[in-house]
Amino acid sequence: AGSDNPYVPCAPSPCVNGGTCRQTGDFTFECSCLPGFEGSTCERNIDDCPNHRCQNGGVCVDGVNTYNCRCPPQWTGQFCTEDVDECLLQPNACQNGGTCTNRNGGYGCVCVNGWSGDDCSENIDDCAFASCTPGSTCIDRVASFSCMCPEGKAGLLCHLDDACISNPCHKGALCDTNPLNGHYICTCPQGYKGADCTEDVDECAMTNSNPCEHAGKCVNTDGAFHCECLKGYAGPRCEMDINECHSDPCQNDATCLDKIGGFTCLCMPGFKGVHCEIEINEGNSGLNDIFEAQKIEWHENLYFQGHHHHHHHH
């Protein structure tokens, strides 16, 4: 080296990573390294992992004069010593209504009836322990099973002879088999009763009210009944008031008033009669008018009183 550019070992410092340079001779130096580094120029990071203390399955990751731990999912903290509360972290850790219990390094599920597995996601196969009669098909359900019976068999386990095979239910009744004893149960159609649905229901003798309205007469029939209605009523239960005005019985522009079982015609001046069909003689018109008006008023009073209305005379 020329005298113009003399070599100074520590200028610039060859020590890296914060190492301090000390000149030991004209052309020599020594680096004093910071903790965690080694080598003639402190170039090497000392591997701290051989002496690591990562717990619970944590993996050591070297740092500068220290180390860090990469934790498995169930653990946290610098050294993986802190338990992760999976029940808090994953609200659905346990499925199908299972109860979650946090544990060191994991969690546990207490499953409700019918479910199993670590997270209660497996439906227990109840058919594995079922005793469906041979020939029937077992269907697994949650915490239970059901047996699908072949023709002629019935009951919870298909162990009973199906009493419906002999068609014991009459009148188109629906037949079911009691799953406990194998007896038939008939669901009778309207109008019939009894174990086999052979007995007629007397609708007219029922203790509650007459099924026929407006004082209609009830007549029992096989499996049903019918109503004989009073004059002025119609319908299966005499529920309809017949509108006698419907056929326009009033003549000469008269107004028709419908009544129970009949009608009244309000005649135009100069006419009279049930249907206002009679033309009045003009000579007696004044007297006839008064007579007709009174007759009409009498009819109106009857009509309104029959319907519980009050009629005021003005």
Epitope: H52, R53, Q55, N56, C80, G105
Partner: antibody, heavy 120, light 107 residues
Framework: EVQLVESGGGLVQPGGSLKLSCAVS????????MEWVRQASGKGLEWVAA??????????VYSASVKDRFTISRDDSKSTLYLQMNSLKTEDTAVYYC???????????WGQGTLVTVSS | DIQMTQSPSSVSASVGDRVTITCQTS??????LAWYQQKPGKSPKLLIY???RLQDGVPSRFSGSGSGTDYTLTISSLQPEDFATYYC?????????FGGGTKVEIK
């Protein structure tokens, strides 16, 4: 209940060998770091060796004072930890404890200890 | 290796006294410190881990504190069964190292 029971201690001449055993129960052996710690009469506690758990490949660490002379090992099928001690010296005389590293950077379960006496 | 300096080496105290033991480490151990109690002829028993966490079944009169390089064990009200030797231990890295111990004696 966590239990650790040491055995195999006794009197041995300098240069001799001895194998200590530690039978464990009450926990999953392979899940834990296991340690050997010794205590000379009237003295403090001195860590000797450790074997990490299965998750850490059962890697092993020794104190400088026993390196190349002692060997730590385990038999998971028997749930037993061992310490093979060779080239024994008088200063190895101590009560040897087997302990479990409980995943807390601390030794949470200890055996009753077994006495090793190295003397001529 | 991490050096552990425990003090005092012994302390004389009476039942009901408050006792404090300190432990200093040669480098930051990130709260990876444990305290043990040992009675003559018996194995050590873990009292405190993680510098301040009480081990299951240990009476609440025992407490730990500290971080970095300075740690303390406190017995708030000394009981007759507490007369023993106490050790600190760093669990940050191997080799594990223990303090020299503190003997708590009856005054």
């Amino acid at each position: 209940e966590v239990q650790l029971v040491e055995s195999g201690g006794g009197l041995v001449q300098p240069g001799g060998s001895l194998k200590l055993s530690c039978a464990v129960s009450g926990f999953t052996f392979s899940d834990f770091y296991m340690e050997w710690v010794r205590q000379a009469s009237g003295k403090g506690l001195e860590w000797v060796a450790a074997q990490r758990n299965k998750a850490n490949d059962f890697s092993i660490v020794y104190s400088a004072s026993v390196k190349d002379r002692f060997t730590i090992s385990r038999d998971d099928s028997k749930s037993t930890l061992y310490l093979q001690m060779n080239s024994l010296k008088t200063e190895d005389t101590a009560v040897y404890y087997c302990s479990r590293d409980g995943g807390k950077l601390a030794l949470d379960a200890w055996g009753q200890g077994t006495l090793v006496t190295v003397s001529s | 290796d991490i050096q552990m300096t425990q003090s005092p080496s012994s302390v004389s105290a009476s039942v009901g006294d408050r006792v404090t033991i300190t432990c200093q480490t040669s480098e930051d151990i990130y709260s990876g410190l444990a305290w043990y109690q040992q009675k003559p002829g018996k194995s050590p028993k873990l009292l405190i881990y993680g510098a301040s966490r009480l081990q299951d079944g240990v009476p609440s009169r025992f407490s730990g504190s500290g971080s970095g390089t300075d740690y303390t064990l406190t017995i708030s009200s000394l009981q007759p069964e507490d007369f023993a030797t106490y050790y600190c231990q760093q669990g940050f890295k191997y080799p594990l190292t223990f303090g020299g111990g503190t003997k708590v004696e009856i005054k």
